[in-house]
Amino acid sequence: WPPPGTGDVVVQAPTQVPGFLGDSVTLPCYLQVPNMEVTHVSQLTWARHGESGSMAVFHQTQGPSYSESKRLEFVAARLGAELRNASLRMFGLRVEDEGNYTCLFVTFPQGSRSVDIWLRVLAKPQNTAEVQKVQLTGEPVPMARCVSTGGRPPAQITWHSDLGGMPNTSQVPGFLSGTVTVTSLWILVPSSQVDGKNVTCKVEHESFEKPQLLTVNLTVYYPPEVSISGYDNNWYLGQNEATLTCDARSNPEPTGYNWSTTMGPLPPFAVAQGAQLLIRPVDKPINTTLICNVTNALGARQAELTVQVKEGPPSEHSGISRN
């Protein structure tokens, strides 16, 4: 004979089972019987904590009975068969189904054996992320918005960016009872440097295998930021023609470039070609301050550049010369 205490009948079940709102879920529950042990199961019982009576009973002679017959079903228990599997299927999961359930086997001669299972009712949220298009304000404003709709429990939203920024997260009840919609705003002082950069919204939820990452491309509307390039302070009489470029960053894109001088219109040697200004060869020294004025939908900004064409040997220098 095996020594006493070598084994006992044990009820095996997961401590927690997830199920989705509106779906069906199986609460697994099995009786584990050691090899040499004799046991007889006369009844399987499911009860919910805090409620009197049983929600489901399978009796060896009478078969199953349910508190809600349309929503509950023993998966494997059959009349005339050994009762070792008490797994119970629940249909049409509701928020109020979440809670602790006890699965109990009435075994002879070992007595009643039970285990508790926590049923988690989940709802998988839908996630969206969108840019909040902003202008230069000088103070922090929402620049991106991430929404996780109809989750249970509420989703966790975090932001990932090299730009700094602060999250502002809020919750409201979802469309379905017991669900939650989480909205997170990413807040920063807008600047032209931020325009076109990316921030990532990370949404975590029990129902996801891995976090969902949503990328937002930031938009900051700002008037043109203007500079003039192409002049190196070494322009001399007799050198080839040169080009100055009016460099403008703006959002939206520039709608117009206007070249002038502090004295008024452009002199004959300067020819405007959109963002570029062609400087033709000259035969006498020049000292002129050029202005590039750039316009976009938000306004106009300008940059000035003083250009000098000096006397000197053209062979050693770049710049303007006759052919």
Partner: antibody, heavy 121, light 109 residues
């Protein structure tokens, strides 16, 4: 109250069979487990088998396998134990006992008064 | 074949405490042995006292308590009464069968 009433004493010849009855009252018979136990003169108690009245499922002490049969009649709430190929050392008082639940545990709750079976040539 | 051993006899004074033990030949008694205790008074039917090591049956006086004591099952009677004078049997479960102890004759005097 719960009662188990057993049939009267039996005298049998070696090789014969005996069938002892145990009539239950005061509880739901079909949901019960009943054990049979015997006590030979000057000897200790010996467990023979148990039966689940609702289905007739049984578990026998291997010592008696093949010689003993336990049955129930749910219409009369009666359990039976038949012992075949009787030998003189089967002479004993035979008891039926109903197992009851105390909390989550079974115990030998209520016993019949015993049936004396004498095997003698 | 498992053998269950009890003290053949014990004596207790009225109001006193006595512990009856139940040893298994196969090793320590555990909860898996589902120790049961039954009582038989002279001229009366057996009566169940304890199931599952330490669970008193309905109507069984609180002075009876079951436990595991070291490697044995035990029945403790606290505040013995004259009517507790009886034969006490321990029953152990061994995976597929019950085995009875030889019984303890308890005298209250």
């Amino acid at each position: 109250q719960v009662q188990l009433v057993q049939s009267g004493a039996e005298v049998k010849k070696p090789g014969a069979s005996v069938k002892v009855s145990c009539k239950a009252s005061g509880y739901t018979f079909t949901s019960s487990y009943i054990s049979w136990v015997r006590q030979a003169p000057g000897q200790g108690l010996e467990w023979i088998a148990w039966i689940y009245a609702g289905t007739g499922d049984t578990n026998y002490n291997q010592k008696f396998t093949g010689r003993v049969t336990m049955t129930t009649d749910t219409s009369t709430s009666t359990a039976y134990m038949e012992l075949r190929s009787l030998r003189s050392d089967d002479t004993a008082v035979y008891y039926c006992a109903r197992h009851g639940l105390t909390g989550r545990h079974w115990y030998f709750a209520v016993w019949g008064q015993g049936t004396t079976v004498t095997v003698s040539s | 074949q498992a053998v269950v051993t009890q003290e053949p006899s014990l004596t207790v004074s009225p109001g006193g405490t006595v512990t009856l033990t139940c040893r298994s030949s196969t090793g320590a008694v555990t909860t898996s042995n589902i120790a049961n205790w039954v009582q038989q008074k002279p001229g009366q039917a057996f009566r169940g006292l304890i199931g599952g090591t330490n669970n008193r049956g309905p109507g069984v006086p609180a002075r009876f308590s079951g436990s595991l004591l070291g490697d044995k099952a035990a029945l403790t009677l606290s505040g013995a009464q004259p009517e507790d004078e009886a034969e006490y049997y321990c029953i152990l479960w061994y995976s597929n069968k019950f085995v009875f102890g030889g019984g303890t004759k308890l005298t209250v005097l």
